[in-house]
């Protein structure tokens, strides 16, 4: 009985032509949506003139359908039992699932001003930047449409810089017609306990963003895990969105459309400072903003973003230290809404439902040379938006799963 089921499962979760796993892996059968909430700044002038707390009001959801494109360049390597692929990016706006349109306007931090003043440190360059910021009538904050903010716009200040700088900015620019990878993952043919585990990403086993073990590419991409998942396991996975590997731990048993699944969550410990979780020492990349590595709940991913001062956190600075959220008014973190979870069917290791939540923030610092940042008296990690990417197994697929997998076990 059980042995036969195990044998069948082992056969069907291998990532090769003809298996159930492969069919769903190449092109997910689940509809995946990415909801965005934008933090609309209510008091831009007071912040710029008096270094006041930033008052934000979230507006959303603005929903896009994502991950609808099949993996590309899928290539099996029989020699090392791996399969490599590219994951194409695409996003389609869903008006019926959104509070407004892509043309809605938001007052947000000026991405170009914050990034350029951070990266271009030379004194004379800063003088040039200051004159061009003024000439282009740019400021510390700007009004942008949702479409511009997410997918890119030509910045008026950067367009005047007399060097070959990047003039188009956007939080996810470029996105459409790009692809993530190349990923090379184990197909499980020789060893089912390695199935879907990433061997290399962009041709390397390390990221080159972090020191020591923090730089490792661990586990799968979280879409599936090797079969026969135990509650005691720590599930490692890599997320290119946050430029690091992270992990989830068992939280509870959940019934999903009649299928028993294990809910795994990202624990607060994963976001802790090295003071509380020494393993995290290598995610602390500088001493000033992190207050000597005592701040927690924000991850400086600038090295992964060409030096732009991007910080990733959980929405509303959930699990972050008070000093991070202190300069921002209007945030209300709560676990239920803002944490990330994966609902995993333990026999197959498939993720049947998930909610990936993260927040994109940008650091802005006072600058003596740049007039629009001159009055700032402190550093701000400014929330720009947070997102909730969700997917749930469809009813039809759930029926198939119940009859072919869980039904047979019970």
């Amino acid at each position: 009985g059980d042995l036969l089921i195990q044998k069948t499962i082992k056969k069907q979760v291998v990532l090769e032509e003809g298996t159930i796993a492969f069919k769903n892996w190449v092109k997910t059968g689940t509809e995946v949506y990415r909801q965005f909430w934008i933090f609309d700044v209510q008091n831009p002038q007071e912040v710029m003139m008096n270094s006041s707390n930033i008052q934000v009001k979230q507006r959303g959801p603005y929903t896009y359908r994502v991950r609808f494109l099949a993996k590309e360049n899928v290539t099996q390597d029989a020699e090392d039992n791996t399969v490599s692929f590219l994951q194409p990016n695409g996003a389609i706006f869903e008006p019926s699932l959104s509070v407004g349109t892509e043309a809605d306007n938001f007052t947000v931090l000026n991405l170009a001003v914050a990034a350029a003043s951070h990266i271009y440190q030379n004194q004379f360059v800063q003088m040039i930047l200051n004159s061009l910021i003024n000439k282009s009538k740019s400021s510390m904050f700007q009004v942008r449409t949702l479409r511009e903010l997410l997918w890119g716009y030509r910045d008026p200040f950067l367009s005047l810089v007399p060097y070959p700088v990047t003039t188009t900015v956007g939080l996810f620019y470029p996105y459409n017609n790009t692809a993530d990878g190349v990923y090379k993952v184990f197909n499980g043919k020789d060893n089912i306990s390695k199935v879907a585990i990433i061997d290399t990403y962009k041709g390397k086993r390390n990221l080159s963003y972090w020191e020591s073990h923090c730089d490792m590419i661990n586990g799968t991409d979280a879409a599936s895990f090797p079969p026969f998942v135990e509650k005691s396991q720590v599930l490692q996975f890599f997320s290119s969105d946050i430029c690091r590997s992270i992990y989830a731990v068992f939280e509870s048993d959940v019934n999903l459309k009649g299928i028993p699944v294990y809910r795994f969550v990202l624990p607060s410990k994963a976001f802790a400072s090295p003071v509380e979780n020494p393993d995290n020492y290598c995610f602390c990349t500088e001493k000033i903003i992190s207050k000597n590595c005592t701040s927690y709940g924000v991850l400086d991913i600038s090295k992964c973003k060409e030096g732009r001062p991007v910080y990733i956190s959980l929405p509303h600075f959930l699990y972050a230290s008070p000093d991070v959220s202190e300069p921002i008014d209007g945030l209300n973190p709560n676990e239920e809404e803002h944490r990330t979870y994966l609902d995993i069917e333990p026999i197959t290791g498939f993720t049947l439902q998930f909610a990936k939540r993260l927040q994109v923030n940008l650091l802005v610092k006072p600058s003596e040379k740049i007039q629009v940042l001159k009055n700032l008296k402190r550093n701000y990690i400014v929330p720009i938006l947070w997102l909730n990417e969700t997917g749930t197994i469809g009813d039809e697929k759930a029926n198939m799963f119940r009859s072919q997998v869980t039904g047979k076990i019970n």
Epitope: I119, N122, Y163, P164, G307
Partner: nanobody, 124 residues
């Protein structure tokens, strides 16, 4: 890797003149001398390094510290990969080590290079 070599420093009496030169070499991967904004900085003992004069990559715009305006002139010769600082009406407070700087931007990167410096002493 860009190398910058300053020359022309020395001992000069108050009211005198000097012309500093900075020769640039080692340009690679699509960058030429005319890709760089060039600057002169100075640092007196126990003081912070200060920007004295600068010229844009195209040579169409210059900047001077208030303390040297009307006395110092920065210029560049892109054919010779050299930037100059002509210093007139020198004062004892101009005594410092003078450093040449080259900077350019590409994408989201800043490429910033420094020379070893040349000493200028204004004394009677």
């Amino acid at each position: 890797q860009v190398q910058l070599q300053e020359s022309g420093g020395g001992l000069v009496q108050p009211g005198g003149s000097l012309r500093l030169s900075c020769a640039a070499s080692g340009f690679t991967s699509g960058f030429t001398f005319s890709s760089y904004a060039m600057s002169w900085y100075r640092q007196a003992p126990g003081k912070e390094r200060e920007l004295v004069a600068a010229i844009t990559n195209a040579g169409d715009s210059t900047h001077y510290a208030d303390s040297v305006k009307g006395r110092f002139t920065i210029s560049r010769d892109n054919a010779k990969n050299t930037v100059y600082l002509l210093m007139n009406s020198l004062k004892p407070e101009d005594t410092a080590a003078y450093y040449c700087n080259a900077v350019t931007l590409q994408g989201w990167s800043e490429y910033d290079y420094w020379g070893q410096g040349t000493q200028v002493t204004v004394s009677s």
